[in-house]
């Protein structure tokens, strides 16, 4: 229903704490360079204004849209052009163009320093002094680095953070309590970020229909006992929630997500038998829990999919009658039978089925033409299954770091023009799929591997879009979202690439590497590995292994030496010479 004052409506629905958190996230995602204090000031002003509208919905400006109110706030920031350049031009536009302009200027890779976690004592001190400000800083720092982070989920992670600090800051050994717990939250939040970015990409590039198809497949896998009307309702509502969040309408998004959670909990009987535990939790935990709830038990007596979609004499009539509904029903029926498939694979199968009907229903004898469609799915299913087997075998043999290195070599050969930091980041993320998915039961591996890889490759595409350098990457990124992963997997060595000349300074290291944390050391070594491949794209695995082993030995020796600097300056050039010889 329409409200006199949108801002008062959202404030009342969300409550002050969530309202302020969401406004802070929104501002931090739009203006990524502003300091926390600048944003906190704006948030307070917006909140004070919302309260005046709650008291009197007819007060001045209370009837304005949220985009107008928030946009006016952002455009009033001093030195906007100096700090943000052409983003300031957005302020010359009217809504809704102004908001669209802000969205287009969101930067997926902002030049901000990595978010460093303070040491435990300092963290606990500032948390105890002012928990609200402390959590505000967390929301601000995450949101500005991840401008498409799913806002209500970020509130959930902040709540997790808060609970961990409350618990650990009361312990004697704060450090050993905080580190593993906060690392766990960070890992989950980073995965959440790339997954949500993929959803926004789907929405931005291919529209609501594409996202809704993704949602139908995913929900049908999770809720195989729900009927198609129920799945359609959930998918429609979920599409609206994600559209709002991807579009920067964070208050509406969070409000509608809470409504969806409420609906699901009130209609468990028609959705799933697995929801009760989630539904007993408070709002943020409830919505998070529902988003990753375990799959319900599949109905025992599901008929073969062929009955309705191949053997039925009226397939073409039913398809022509309501194409989207018929294809939606197919996707629903196939997905509920296959929780062991990735959503990407299910969407590829639905696309294949649609193409088959389009072709066959125009022919003289359609049943003879589409009769083999399910058999034609086989190669599409085998390809990702083989990918999972090959990669999980390799992961089990090499471990995470070795597996990342194997992927780094593979992807540097596929797209050597891509910047080394991007290749290293991508390979490290892709390599984590082993730890994340290969340890799961067999029937959960494929959905875990492929849907995670797709999300990571989406980030590769977004970064590459900013500065396109590789025709291979452009080709894979410009196709449909579900075809990206198979496209990247099929890429081979880029034969058009002219190898980089060997620069000794690229492979020159200093004693400061010895004191770096293990993760940073790995990144340095992986940077060197990518540069080696760029120098010798056709180097064999054996050659690269020889060089990397030599490099690791060199680091080990020099970092243990009494005079590290001398060791690095004398042994370093020898290492460079040996590398050149090994790769000659």
């Amino acid at each position: 229903e329409a409200h006199k004052s949108e801002i008062a409506h959202r404030y009342n629905d969300l409550g002050e704490q969530h309202f302020k958190g969401l406004v802070l996230i929104a501002f931090s995602q739009y203006l990524q360079k502003c300091s926390y204090d600048e944003h906190a000031k704006l948030v307070q002003e917006v909140t004070d204004f919302a309260k005046t509208c709650v008291a009197d919905e007819s007060a001045a400006n209370c009837d304005k849209s949220l985009h107008t109110l928030f946009g006016d706030k952002l455009c009033a920031i001093p030195n906007l052009r100096e700090n943000y350049g052409e983003l300031a031009d957005c302020c010359t536009k009217q809504e809704p163009e102004r908001n669209e302009c802000f969205l287009q200027h969101k930067d997926d890779n902002p030049s901000l320093p990595p978010f460093e976690r303070p040491e435990a004592e300092a963290m606990c001190t500032s948390f105890k002094e002012n928990p609200t400000t402390f959590m505000g800083h967390y929301l601000h720092e995450v949101a500005r680095r991840h401008p498409y982070f799913y806002a209500p989920e970020l509130l959930y992670y902040a709540e997790q953070y808060n609970e961990i600090l409350t618990q650990c800051c009361a312990e004697a050994d704060k450090e050993s309590c905080l580190t593993p717990k906060l690392d766990g939250v960070k890992e989950k939040a980073l995965v959440s970020s790339v997954r949500q970015r993929m959803k926004c990409s789907s929405m931005q590039k291919f529209g609501e229909r594409a996202f809704k198809a993704w949602a139908v497949a995913r929900l049908s896998q999770t809720f195989p006992n729900a009927d198609f009307a129920e799945i359609t309702k959930l998918a429609t509502d979920l599409t609206k929630v994600n559209k709002e969040c991807c579009h920067g309408d964070l208050l509406e998004c969070a409000d509608d997500r809470a409504e969806l959670a409420k609906y699901m909990c009130e209609n468990q009987a028609t959705i799933s038998s697995k929801l009760q535990t989630c539904c007993d939790k408070p709002l943020l935990k409830k919505a998070h829990c529902l988003s990753e709830v375990e799959h319900d038990t599949m109905p025992a007596d599901l008929p073969a999919i062929a009955a309705d979609f191949v053997e039925d004499q009226e397939v073409c009539k039913n398809y022509a009658e309501a194409k989207d509904v018929f294809l939606g029903t197919f996707l629903y029926e196939y997905s509920r039978r296959h929780p062991d498939y990735s959503v990407s694979l299910l969407l590829r199968l639905a696309k294949k089925y649609e193409a088959t009907l389009e072709k066959c229903c125009a022919e003289a004898n359609p049943p003879a033409c589409y009769g083999t469609v399910l058999a034609e799915f086989q190669p599409l299913v085998e390809e990702p299954k083989n990918l999972v087997k090959t990669n999980c075998d390799l992961y089990e043999k090499l471990g995470e770091y070795g597996f990342q290195n194997a992927i780094l070599v593979r992807y540097t050969q596929k797209a050597p023009q891509v910047s080394t930091p991007t290749l290293v980041e991508a390979a490290r993320n892709l390599g984590r799929v082993g730890t994340k998915c290969c340890t799961l039961p067999e029937d959960q591996r494929l959905p875990c591997v492929e849907d995670y890889l797709s999300a990571i490759l989406n980030r590769v595409c977004l970064l590459h879009e900013k500065t396109p350098v590789s025709e291979h990457v452009t080709k894979c990124c410009s196709g449909s979202l579900v075809e990206r992963r198979p496209c990247f997997s099929a890429l081979t060595v880029d034969e058009t690439y002219v190898p980089k000349e060997f620069k000794a300074e690229t492979f020159t290291f200093h004693s400061d590497i010895c004191t770096l944390p293990e993760k940073e050391k790995q990144i340095k070594k992986q940077t060197a590995l990518a540069e080696l491949v760029k120098h010798k794209p056709k180097a064999t695995a054996e050659q690269l292994k020889t060089v990397m082993d030599d490099f690791a030995q060199f680091l080990d020796t020099c970092c243990k030496a009494a005079d590290k600097d001398t060791c690095f300056s004398t042994e370093g050039p020898n290492l460079v010479t040996r590398c050149k010889d090994a790769l000659a």
Epitope: D227, F228, A229, E230, T232, K233, L234, T236, N267, A269, T270, D308, E314, N318, E321, A322, V325, F326, T329
Partner: nanobody, 118 residues
């Protein structure tokens, strides 16, 4: 095009029974959730009952629970509503509805009038 044709309405005494039928055409009946909606004189539309495509799950409004039974025969493209222990407040036009999505319906028939009166 989609057609829904209700029948079986009429005048009945309180405590009596009626069976409504709805014959569907123009769409794949077995793929859709179907239901009955009613409108009492001077009132808004109210969901009475709905049934899943495969007939495995049924929903009833609190006001009719235990008295009404919905069923379907997918081979005949027909939906039924068995109404027992009828009361004066059940007087309404009953519409057969095709539901494309939970809590929404996109097509309904012309309706059949049920009058419960002594």
């Amino acid at each position: 095009e989609v057609q829904l044709l209700e029948s079986g309405g009429g005048l009945v005494q309180p405590g009596g029974s009626l069976r409504l039928s709805c014959t569907a055409s123009g769409f794949t009946f077995r793929h859709y959730r179907m239901g009955w909606v009613r409108q009492a004189p001077g009132k808004g539309l109210e969901w009475v009952s709905w049934i899943r495509p495969d007939g495995t799950f049924t929903y009833y409004a609190d006001s009719v629970k235990g008295r009404f039974t919905i069923s379907r025969d997918n081979s005949k493209n027909t939906l039924y509503l068995q109404m027992n222990s009828l009361r004066a407040e059940d007087t309404a036009v009953y519409y057969c509805a095709k539901s494309y999505m939970a809590d929404r319906f996109d097509y309904w028939g012309q309706g059949t009038l049920v009058t419960v009166s002594s």
